[in-house]
């Protein structure tokens, strides 16, 4: 009987040693995993930062084809919005096509919902013609719906799926646009 108990005790001790070993192995494995994770994260970080240096658009800008877009998180009047874009080497958004309009409105829906965003469109005070920032005229399908009854100067903005007009001195978000960096490969 005593021999039996002693054998059981030895088996239990053996089990305990095995469990301790397993625990030790697990701890070691966990530590190694953590180190590998750290290494992987550092590598990812490195890759990301080097990719960032040659990425087509700056951080926080959205890319579509050859253009990069920045959706502001602050409100300003049209003129100040334009200056804010200039500081970034960009202009207020110039919509060239229905495809671009669809991309912008689709992106805005995802980012912020239905707010007003200044674009680079203003009405010439003398002729009443709409002009983009670069002096060109918008295509007929991209003329703002007459919404502003203001006697003041009116500028263009995007809201939901529409291009509208408003007094340039009202406060809105804005969208900047610049060319995406061409790959030098």
């Amino acid at each position: 009987k005593l021999l039996q108990v002693s054998t059981i005790a030895m088996q239990q001790q053996e089990k305990l040693i095995q469990q301790e070993r397993a625990l030790l192995n697990f701890t070691e494995w966990k530590r190694s995993c953590a180190l590998q994770m750290k290494y992987c994260q550092a590598f990812m970080q490195n890759s990301l930062s080097s990719a960032h240096n040659s990425s087509p658009c700056p951080n926080n800008w959205i890319q579509n084809r050859e253009s990069c877009y920045y959706v502001s998180e602050i409100w300003s009047i049209w003129h100040t919005s334009q200056e804010n874009c200039l500081k970034e080497g960009s202009t207020l958004l110039q919509i060239e096509s229905k495809e671009e309009m669809d991309f912008i409105t689709g992106s805005l829906r995802k980012i912020k919902g239905s707010y007003d965003y200044w674009v680079g469109l203003s009405q010439d005070g003398h002729s009443g013609r709409w002009l983009w920032q670069d002096g060109s005229s918008p295509s007929p399908g991209l003329l703002p719906a007459e919404r502003s009854q203001s006697a003041n100067q009116v500028c263009g903005y995007v809201k939901s799926n529409s291009l509208l007009s408003s007094n340039c001195s009202t406060w809105k978000y804005f969208i900047c646009e610049k060319y995406a960096l061409r790959s030098s490969v």
Epitope: W78, G125, D134, V154, C155, S169
Partner: nanobody
Framework: QVQLQESGGGLVQAGGSLRLSCAAS????????MAWYRQAPGKRRELVGG???????GYADSVKGRFTISRDNAKNTAYLQMNSLKPEDTAVYYC??????????WGQGTQVTVSS
């Protein structure tokens, strides 16, 4: 009536420099941002860079480090200093401004040709 007049364009060898001026009249120059654009034959007019009313500047990636924009409010003039010019910088260069009211104005442009 606001008027803008560019000058300083011309023919230059690749690697050379040019300084363009944009003189403004009929506007409170100091409160307006000034932008420089360029248009190569058959291409859309593109932003080169700009200077805001407080003197902050921004540049298109294609000219960063080579072009510098400055302004002299006393002379109502903005400048575009172009160094290390490349054949692909060949274009008509325009200056433009927008007033706080939202009016936009343009100069007639000045031709810059860079030969290789």
């Amino acid at each position: 009536q606001v008027q803008l007049q560019e000058s300083g364009g011309g023919l230059v060898q690749a690697g050379g420099s040019l300084r363009l001026s944009c003189a403004a009249s009929g506007t409170l120059f100091s409160i307006n941002g000034m932008a420089w654009y360029r248009q190569a034959p058959g291409k859309r007019r593109e932003l080169v860079g700009g200077i805001t009313s407080d003197g902050s500047t921004g540049y298109a990636d294609s000219v960063k480090g080579r072009f510098t924009i400055s302004r002299d409010n006393a002379k109502n003039t903005a400048y575009l200093q172009m160094n290390s010019l490349k054949p692909e910088d060949t274009a008509v260069y325009y200056c433009g401004t927008s007033t706080p009211r939202g009016d936009s104005y343009w100069g007639q442009g000045t031709q810059v040709t860079v030969s290789s």
